[in-house]
Amino acid sequence: YDFTNCDFEKIKAAYLSTISKDLITYMSGTKSTEFNNTVSCSNRPHCLTEIQSLTFNPTAGCASLAKEMFAMKTKAALAIWCPGYSETQINATQAMKKRRKRKVTTNKCLEQVSQLQGLWRRFNRPLLKQQ
């Protein structure tokens, strides 16, 4: 999906009002400097691409974050403010239902959400170029 035509300000507002709090809640108990920041993004569409990948794609050691509150709210924000996004996710969602696992917060997941916080932080930069 190409995130170029999203309403970035509306997504930013969604992040500031709710998603940020859910990320904070998920990370509760984690030490500030426990994880190095290794993932970056250079503009808002790129940030959303990275955010979508880290939030919804299973990785080694962190099978799924998709059922977490911050992920569901991220998905809703992208569906509402990115034209055509929800259509591209139908197949992915069906595959996710087949794969659904018990929620376990692993250290790898905490590291991944720490990277997500960094990506969202970059997405919110006021002077970050759109494209």
Epitope: S20, I24, K31, S32, T33, F35, S40
Partner: antibody, heavy 118, light 107 residues
Framework: QVQLVQSGAEVKKPGASVKVSCKAS????????MHWVRQAPGQCLEWMGE????????DYNQNFRGRVTITVDMSASTAYMELSSLRSEDTAVYYC???????????WGQGTLVTVSS | DIQMTQSPSFLSASVGDRVTITCKAS??????VAWYQQKPGKAPKLLIY???MRHTGVPSRFSGSGSGTEFTLTISSLQPEDFATYFC?????????FGCGTKLEIK
């Protein structure tokens, strides 16, 4: 282990600028955010701003925007905080402090006293 | 910005006393609150993060609690080295803000 070592005390005249340094060691300089916090005599701690050394992006407290500039010298693993148009109420101890993506401060510099006096 | 209102500003107590310091946030900060101890001429030292988690090396007599907008720091049995100034800080929202401190003095 992580260490943040700041430059020495400064005395400045009103209207002048001051530049305080913070040399970091014991970790990869680009991995964490560097913040500056100040404490005026008998006042609250006040967060001034931060820099991401990986790309030198800065965020500032609105109260200081336009007067404070935070920079880094990657080769020296050193962060700098410059405050301009100094006034007497800027007399304070200035601290550098370190965080990851979660913004509480588990590492602090020793502090630099800046006195603004005519 | 979120305001952190700390009380009391001054507290006199004796060695062995149990003391409680309170911090109120002007809006919900979940559990994103830290507590620091500061002694004269020194930088603040982290005591508690995530409202209730003790930092490495912090004695068990220090404990934190709370969520949402009300938070407390409790010292169960004051020791001579505990007489200092204590600050709370919220890190839920940019700009990061501190309480104005509680100075704990010997009675």
């Amino acid at each position: 282990q992580v260490q943040l070592v700041q430059s020495g005390a400064e005395v400045k005249k009103p209207g002048a600028s001051v530049k305080v340094s913070c040399k970091a060691s014991g970790y990869t300089f680009t991995s964490y955010l560097m913040h500056w916090v100040r404490q005026a005599p008998g006042q609250c701690l006040e967060w001034m701003g931060e820099i991401d050394p990986s790309d030198s992006y800065t965020d500032y407290n609105q109260n200081f925007r336009g007067r404070v500039t935070i920079t880094v010298d990657m080769s020296a693993s050193t962060a700098y905080m410059e405050l301009s148009s100094l006034r007497s109420e800027d007399t304070a101890v200035y601290y550098c402090a370190l965080t990851g993506t979660i913004n509480y401060f588990d590492y602090w510099g020793q502090g630099t006293l800046v006195t603004v006096s005519s | 910005d979120i305001q952190m209102t700390q009380s009391p500003s001054f507290l006199s107590a004796s060695v062995g006393d149990r003391v409680t310091i309170t911090c109120k946030a002007s809006q919900d900060v979940v559990t994103a609150v830290a507590w620091y101890q500061q002694k004269p001429g020194k930088a603040p030292k982290l005591l508690i993060y995530w409202a209730s988690m003790r930092h490495t090396g912090v004695p068990s007599r220090f404990s934190g609690s709370g969520s949402g907008t009300e938070f407390t720091l409790t010292i169960s049995s004051l020791q001579p080295e505990d007489f200092a100034t204590y600050f709370c800080q919220q890190y839920s929202s940019f700009t990061f803000t501190f309480g104005c401190g509680t100075k704990l003095e010997i009675k």
